[in-house]
Amino acid sequence: QEEDLPRPSISAEPGTVIPLGSHVTFVCRGPVGVQTFRLERDSRSTYNDTEDVSQASPSESEARFRIDSVREGNAGLYRCIYYKPPKWSEQSDYLELLVKESSGGPDSPDTEPGSSAGPTQRPSDNSHNEHAPASQGLKAEHLY
């Protein structure tokens, strides 16, 4: 039997309730050795990939996906998946981003922290090469 890959986790900084125009960063975490992290929105067809992976701890790697100015259209469900050669992981649970009318400045503290970890779907079917991740955007809309 193949060795299981641990599920990724997803969190949002500074939280999951973000004022319009403020920034948010999604943080995807997985084991060491991850080559590519993918942040998916709602379904597999809308995603962003990054190979800018850093080591968060001796046993964990992470990638960060930043939206500089959140719009209403950024609200929705997000999840992470990673590629650790030669396999894609299962996906994290969904994290819901809520966008609200700005009541203060961009650094207004009225956000709620949020994180999630668990299952879901798959990467886009961009590559049938089991030893390479699907190339970004070939069949996908970009998140932002």
Partner: antibody, heavy 121, light 111 residues
Framework: EQSLEESGGDLVKPGASLTLACTAS?????????MCWVRQAPGKGLEWIGC???????IYYASWAKGRFTISKTSSTMVTLQMSSLTAADTATYFC??????????????WGPGTLVTISS | ELVMTQTPASVSEAVGGTVTIKCQAS??????LAWYQQKPGQRPKLLIY???SLASGVSSRFRGSRSGTEYTLTITDLECDDAATYYC?????????????FGGGTEVEIK
Amino acid sequence: EQSLEESGGDLVKPGASLTLACTASGFSFSDGYYMCWVRQAPGKGLEWIGCIHSSSGSIYYASWAKGRFTISKTSSTMVTLQMSSLTAADTATYFCARDSESYGYNPCELWGPGTLVTISS
Amino acid sequence: ELVMTQTPASVSEAVGGTVTIKCQASQTISNYLAWYQQKPGQRPKLLIYAASSLASGVSSRFRGSRSGTEYTLTITDLECDDAATYYCQCTYYGTTYIGGAFGGGTEVEIK
């Protein structure tokens, strides 16, 4: 066109073992699908047996199926269901199903036609 | 262990009527709920995923909704072709709990 085809259904005696195969075409296991086995006894409802994630290798079983049923990925296009110590209660049509390519939350969107397993002496 | 309790076991309704089928999850399953239609001798067909999202090609007469751990499939403006057995399924496979369980099914007869 994407499809699934089960094979290996047979008439076997109580206590015997049997292995069913599910062959996929039109898509790649490397893209990470949940490949599931579901059974349906004659005139009864659907019963989930378990699933394997085709890329990561993670396997999930119904509690009643653990120990007697084993799901494996045997190639880039085939998953199998090994069944042991079979009894008359295991008589059913066995379906292979795959979760969705375009929807979230893992619904079984693609189903095979099923293969009939009959346990009788 | 997750249990999906589906009610009623059977229902009979006239053409043009409305049928409501409920599925109660024994614990929170966070919208990981699908509804299927199955006709005798056929494989199941996906109708609803994520509790309330309609699968492609499925009539908008089928509607899914959620209230806490209770999930509902409503079929309006019934047609003869809707005669079938309907199943709910938890579609979460993970570490929190093992999903996959189906409800017992609801046989819909069209009068």
